[in-house]
């Protein structure tokens, strides 16, 4: 007996209050189906009901979290129904407050190296889920370590490749309610660096400026980079600008830093729009120093 295929659109991780579409596809082309939920709290809107093509479920509540299967209409079967489909686990987020997600030693990871993603919370979560944006497979399930101040998990990811780079979020859950998840952590962009040759970084009017003077950092390369990223040592985040083709055949971006008050070591990276989390080697560091200011960090 042909089993139908059950899928969830846009995915199986759904924010509380949002909608999710459950689609049941029969290889025999029958478009009527029934839905059942195997665990957790009952969902009355599924009972004694025949759906056509797909079902828009929502606004979802914690009660909707659980494992679903569908059976499609099957006129040649004794019961009139197919065998049950594959299971689809719907996880509902926003039930607990969000955990925090960090990368050690940092979110910029050299190609081939390993990064540790640490998800932690002051809530005692026995389970954590790690989810990468744009991936339809189930999130990675991790066992949390409980301690007096809450819980955490460390996940070692590597060797680093563009396939592992992306935007990550983590969620927490408790054992007795495994499909009711916390709100997502703030997103963390994991970037693989060292995939292309390094760009050049220079300063106009120069790397030593008076306090309050304007300085512009120019990042350039003969590679056809679409975007340049400028980062300052010991600072999270980066400035991002689109590259412009110059007359001399280089691709360049100018970062106006405005009136500077303190200096620091700057680096820039190049990347392509099609692979936003895959960057070049860093430029050589450019120390910018500010005179007439004691805070030359």
């Amino acid at each position: 007996q042909d089993k139908p295929f059950l899928s969830a659109w846009p995915g199986t991780v759904v924010s509380e209050g949002q909608h999710v579409t459950l689609q049941c596809r029969s290889r025999l082309g029958f478009n009527e189906f029934s839905l059942s939920k195997e665990d957790g709290m009952p969902v009355p809107e599924l009972y004694n009901r025949i759906f056509r093509n797909s079902f828009l479920m929502g606004p979802v509540t914690p009660a909707h979290a659980g494992t679903y299967r569908c059976c499609s209409s099957h006129p040649h079967s004794p019961t009139g129904w197919s065998a049950p489909s594959n299971p689809v686990v719907i996880m509902v987020t926003g039930v607990h407050r969000k955990p925090s997600l960090l990368a050690h030693p940092g979110p910029l990871v050299k190609s081939g190296e390993t990064v540790i993603l640490q998800c932690w919370s002051d809530v005692r979560f026995e389970r954590f889920l790690l989810h990468r944006e744009g991936i339809t497979e189930d999130p990675l399930r991790l066992v949390g370590q409980l301690h007096d101040a809450g819980s955490q998990v460390n996940y070692s990811m590597g060797p680093m490749t563009p396939a592992l780079a992306g935007t990550y979020r983590c969620f927490g859950s408790v054992t007795h309610l495994p499909y009711e998840l916390s709100a997502p952590s703030d997103p963390l962009d994991i970037v693989v660096v060292g995939l292309y040759g390094k760009p050049s970084l220079s300063a106009q009017p120069g790397p030593t400026v008076q306090a309050g003077e304007n300085v512009t950092l120019s990042c350039s390369s003969r590679s056809l980079f679409d975007i340049y990223h400028l980062s300052r040592e010991a600072e999270a985040g980066e400035l991002r600008l689109t590259a412009v083709l110059r007359v001399n055949g280089t691709f360049q971006a100018n970062f106006p830093l405005g009136p500077v008050t303190h200096g620091g070591n700057y680096r820039c990276f190049g990347s392509f729009r099609a692979l936003p989390h895959a960057w070049s080697d860093p430029s050589d560091p450019l120390p910018v120093s500010v005179t007439g200011n004691s805070r030359n960090l």
Partner: antibody
């Protein structure tokens, strides 16, 4: 600006069907739900059902099951509601509305069509 | 399903009066999941107040909304002639979404 333009009034015979259309403009059709609401003369508002144009997924009020079929054509940004086996109880104004999401659990209908009057009479 | 009961069904008040109408839910509605619509004869409903107390675009500041749990209200601080209409409360906290029976507001 954001608009939902509904098809014109219909006078139909009992037992027949009618298809009401709702053409969206001024926003990304796939990014919002389209809701359908019934209002009988001098009466209140009754939710019929909802369609997500992006996925084709639908949900409906048990009361209208087997009566209303909701579809959407993303190429023309148009939602449709077909009503079958019409009786005098189906004589009403039918509205489409955009289902919008705000904050944490806050769905409301922020833009409404002008309504389509369906009269069922022999 | 969540049943919304509006009271009074019909009310009349003088221009300049303070007017309050209520909406009671049969079970608790999540905070900020209750909305109000205004409808005038021959027209479609208009979103009037969303998420309990936020005024929709173009709605005069004399309107306000409040409430929590199962009890909600819409208040007009000083009634004007253009406020004559039927007002519906609405919840979409649980499927199916439901509307109250409406309060018809008339000018004395």
């Amino acid at each position: 600006q954001v608009q939902l333009q509904q098809s014109g009034a219909e006078l139909v015979r009992p037992g027949t069907s009618v298809k009401v259309s709702c053409k969206a403009s001024g926003y990304a059709f796939n990014n919002y739900l389209i809701e359908w609401v019934k209002q009988r003369p001098g009466q209140g508002l009754e939710w019929i059902g909802v369609i997500n144009p992006g996925s084709g997924g639908t949900n409906d009020n048990e009361k209208f099951r087997g009566k209303a079929t909701l579809t959407a054509d993303t190429s023309s940004s148009t939602a449709y509601m077909q009503l079958t086996s019409l009786t005098s109880d189906d004589s009403a104004v039918y509205f489409c509305a955009r289902g919008n999401y705000y904050g944490t659990r806050d769905w409301y209908f922020d833009v409404w069509g002008a309504g389509t009057t369906v009269t069922v009479s022999s | 399903q969540i049943v919304l009961t509006q009271s009074p069904a019909i009310m009349s008040a003088s221009l300049g009066a303070r007017v309050t109408m209520t909406c009671t839910a049969s079970s608790s509605v999540s905070s900020s999941s209750l909305h109000w619509y205004q409808q005038k004869p021959g027209s479609s409903p208009k979103l009037w107040i969303y998420s309990i107390s936020s005024l929709a675009s173009g709605v005069p500041a004399r309107f306000s909304g409040s409430g929590s749990g199962t009890s909600y209200s819409l208040t007009i601080s000083s009634l004007e002639a253009e406020d004559a209409a039927t007002y519906y409360c609405h919840q979409y906290h649980r499927s199916p979404p439901t509307f109250g029976g409406g309060t018809k507001l008339e000018i004395k």
